[in-house]
């Protein structure tokens, strides 16, 4: 029996219905210069087709506007069609601080990002802003930091704190939800020369996050009243053979090495999971690996512990795992895990298995292990080849949201938001987008609209409206912000 029956019910009124985008590359100049150029031109339409300036004539200009950025106009159009309440996007650290420190701040980039946020607010869409969104091909670090050993260098964490402080200062009056780092637990794909490189980089990423959180807590929270966390890649794991002890122990180990590795120090103890530390140490003792988790000082444990305001998880699929003893001193071999592809299951073109109940199990696991904290699913989605009628995405959204609703209604999980991944796809990349790379809408948009407007899967006669006071409050806040910062 693969699933429990569908439930009817609704998410709470303050639930965030979001869509996620990866890094937004800032446009360096507004793409509509005609409004800021005071000269008059005559277009030689039949001759050389050039514009000729008319001398001696000066026109009135208007101030530059956020919607002069073509890119922003496009995003706003897509977001308006999505009917979401929240938009998650990432800043480009390398664009904002090309030198990696505050000696050269790209104000134009910051203005662009401020425009994205403020224009979204005018549509009633709040931003969840990610400060650092590394991708496997490109670390997204400013050049000087990259050349100075990147995340293997502890000073990168201090540079990140300075960058975070700048962003909080420049955007924090408008942004109430911050993600410091997206999927730091996946950077092992890059820092994988040895396990010790992986664990060292992870350690510096944890410190970077904690420094940024502490800075916000001390300096910005009193006036801005926002919340800060980091997004962990959080796929679920199931034993390939549920009757084999070694398989479920491998699945347990996967969760420890993949999620608890970052969650335990931040959400709970200030230190790495005991199970992970012991497993690596035992392999070390048997001569199967030379890896070792960093030893944390008391000061480091104090720095890390409790530096999250909510739990943010990126969940896409469930992996089937079994135990396989692997020799070698890399993170992947330290875990002794082999992944199995179950070809009987519905899967996407990139072989992501559609296993909706995995998300419910994940949410239950987080609640049991880390307590009753607010949880946001900050990215969740599937790639679908279809350019118009993306039925796999509709099926995925419906089934995964059903399981999230079960976690909320039955398991008492404090789920606060779901951010579908992603807004628009990129050319020649797996098709995760609600819009094609040339901004054509797919039919899953209507499906997501319907779920959002119903606040889930309500009974026939139940109202999807929330109390008027709450709606008014949200509008008042929006108007106030918009008037304050156009």
């Amino acid at each position: 029996k693969e699933s429990t029956p569908d439930v009817q019910g609704q998410f709470p009124c303050d639930f965030s219905w979001g869509v996620t985008e990866s890094v937004l590359k800032p446009e360096s100049v507004a793409s509509s210069p005609q409004f800021s150029d005071p000269h008059l031109y005559v277009w030689n339409a039949t001759g050389n087709r050039l514009l000729h300036r008319v001398e001696g004539v000066r026109l009135k200009t208007r101030p530059a506007q956020c919607t002069d950025f073509v890119n922003i106009k496009k995003q706003l159009e897509m977001l308006a069609r999505m009917k979401v309440t929240h938009y998650r996007f990432a800043l480009d650290w390398a664009s904002v601080l090309p030198t990696g420190n505050l000696s050269a701040v790209n104000r134009q980039a910051l203005r662009y990002y401020r425009c994205v946020v403020s224009e979204g607010l005018k549509l009633g869409i709040s931003a969840m802003v990610t400060l650092y969104y590394p991708t496997h091909a490109h670390l997204g670090l400013p050049e000087p930091l990259l050349h100075a050993d990147g995340w293997l260098n502890p000073s990168t964490a201090e540079a990140f704190q300075a960058y975070a402080g700048l962003c909080f200062q420049e955007l924090g009056d408008l942004v109430k939800l911050w993600i410091t780092i997206n999927e730091p637990n996946r950077l092992s794909d890059i820092y994988n020369r040895s396990g010790n490189d992986t664990y060292g980089a992870a350690h510096n990423l944890l410190v970077a996050h904690a420094l940024a959180w502490r800075l916000y807590d001390r300096q910005f929270r009193p006036s801005q009243r926002g919340a800060v966390s980091l997004s962990l890649h959080a796929d679920w794991a199931e034993p390939a053979n549920p009757y084999a002890d070694s398989h479920w122990r491998a699945a347990e180990r996967f969760l420890q090495f993949e999620i608890a590795w970052f969650a335990e120090p931040l959400f709970k103890t200030g230190d790495y999971p005991a199970a992970m530390r012991e497993y690596i140490a035992s392999k070390h003792r048997r001569g199967l690996s030379s890896s070792a988790l960093p030893r944390l000082t008391e000061a480091e444990r104090r720095l890390l512990k409790g530096t999250v305001d909510f739990c943010a998880l990126n969940h896409f699929t469930t992996r089937f795992v079994m135990h396989e003893q692997l020799a070698g001193s890399r993170y992947d071999s330290d875990r002794d895990i082999q992944f199995l592809q179950d070809i009987t299951r519905l899967s996407s073109p990139t072989r992501l298995a559609v296993i909706p109940w995995g998300v419910r199990k994940l949410l239950r696991w987080v609640r049991r292990n880390y307590g009753d904290m607010d949880i946001y699913i900050t990215a969740s989605g599937i790639d679908d080849q279809a350019l118009e009628d993306d039925r796999l995405r509709k099926y995925y959204l419906g089934k995964y949201l059903q399981e999230v609703l079960k976690a909320y209604l039955i398991d008492k999980v404090r789920i606060k938001g779901y951010y579908a991944f992603k807004l628009a796809e990129e050319k020649s990349k797996p098709r995760f987008g609600f819009f094609t790379s040339d901004f054509k809408a797919k039919s899953s948009i209507q499906f997501y609209n319907k779920v959002i407007s119903s606040r889930g899967f309500p009974f026939e006669n139940s109202s999807s409206r929330c109390s008027q006071t709450q709606e008014n409050t949200e509008c008042t806040v929006c108007l106030f912000l918009v008037q304050k910062k156009p």
């Epitope: 029996k1 693969e2 699933s3 429990t4 199931e238 034993p239 549920p242 009757y243 479920w248 122990r249 699945a251 347990e252 969760l255 959400f267 709970k268 103890t269 005991a274 109940w357 419910r360 199990k361 239950r364 696991w365 609640r367 049991r368 292990n369 880390y370 307590g371 009753d372 008492k412």
Partner: antibody
């Protein structure tokens, strides 16, 4: 050796309250959940609730209005508070350790139990 | 709540013979690919002891004459060759749904 030791049992007046303690040794409450189960004299087992390693609790709905489970990680001790006691609450109260794996919902170690008698 | 009904209520078996205890649930205790059924043994004056988890997995230290099987709503605990020290009350327990519930118990004696 994993051990759970209950204390605080005894005679309680009807309408009164009880507060039981469960001292855990050789494992950490930040890693394992702890359940409370009771057994009326000569009867079967009845699950009351659990406090998970992260501090969240799940209760048997039949007791939710008068039951509170809490813990002190620094003392490695779990507590059960139960109010408005009646004669039918007379039982041996066990605290027991959760298996500690998300893939195994079971109880692997039990305390010896403490007897609570509700009588005037 | 899920009700678990054990049968028989009591069972007398000769030493070395097979003992079989059944446990029927009022609704399925299997979901998401897992069978949430556990078996415990309780001897007089002692707390229960874990025997079988996930319907069929033997807890370490438990003799392999104990085995569990079943799925959905019907589960079985088998003692392949009863020993004197196996005299006890045996309970099934489900954890598929809160509240966790136990069967009423089956008393195993020597014939």
């Amino acid at each position: 050796e994993v051990q759970l030791v209950e204390s605080g049992g005894g005679l309680v007046q009807p309408g009164g309250s009880l507060r039981l303690s469960c001292a855990a040794s050789d494992f950490s409450l930040t890693t394992y959940g702890v359940h409370w189960v009771r057994q009326a004299p000569g009867k079967g087992l009845e699950w009351l609730g659990v406090i998970w390693s992260g501090g969240s609790t799940d209760y048997n709905a039949a007791f939710i209005s008068r039951l509170t489970i809490s813990k002190d990680n620094s003392k490695n001790t779990v507590y059960l508070q139960m109010n408005s006691l009646r004669a039918e609450d007379t039982a041996v109260y066990y605290c027991a350790r959760d298996y500690g794996s998300t893939y195994v919902d079971a109880i692997d170690y039990w305390g010896q139990g403490t007897l609570v008698t509700v009588s005037s | 709540d899920i009700v678990l009904t054990q049968s028989p209520d009591s069972l007398a078996v000769s030493l070395g013979e097979r003992a079989t205890i059944n446990c029927r649930a009022s609704e399925s205790v299997e979901s998401y690919g897992n069978r949430y059924m556990t078996w415990y043994q309780q001897k007089p004056g002692q707390p229960p002891k874990l025997l079988i988890y996930r319907a069929a997995n033997l807890q370490s230290g438990v003799p392999d004459r104990f085995s569990g099987s079943g799925s959905g709503t019907d589960f079985t605990l088998t003692i392949s060759s009863l020993q004197a020290e196996d005299v006890a009350v045996y309970y099934c327990q489900q954890s598929n749904e809160d509240p966790w519930t136990f069967g009423q118990g089956t008393k195993v004696e020597i014939k």
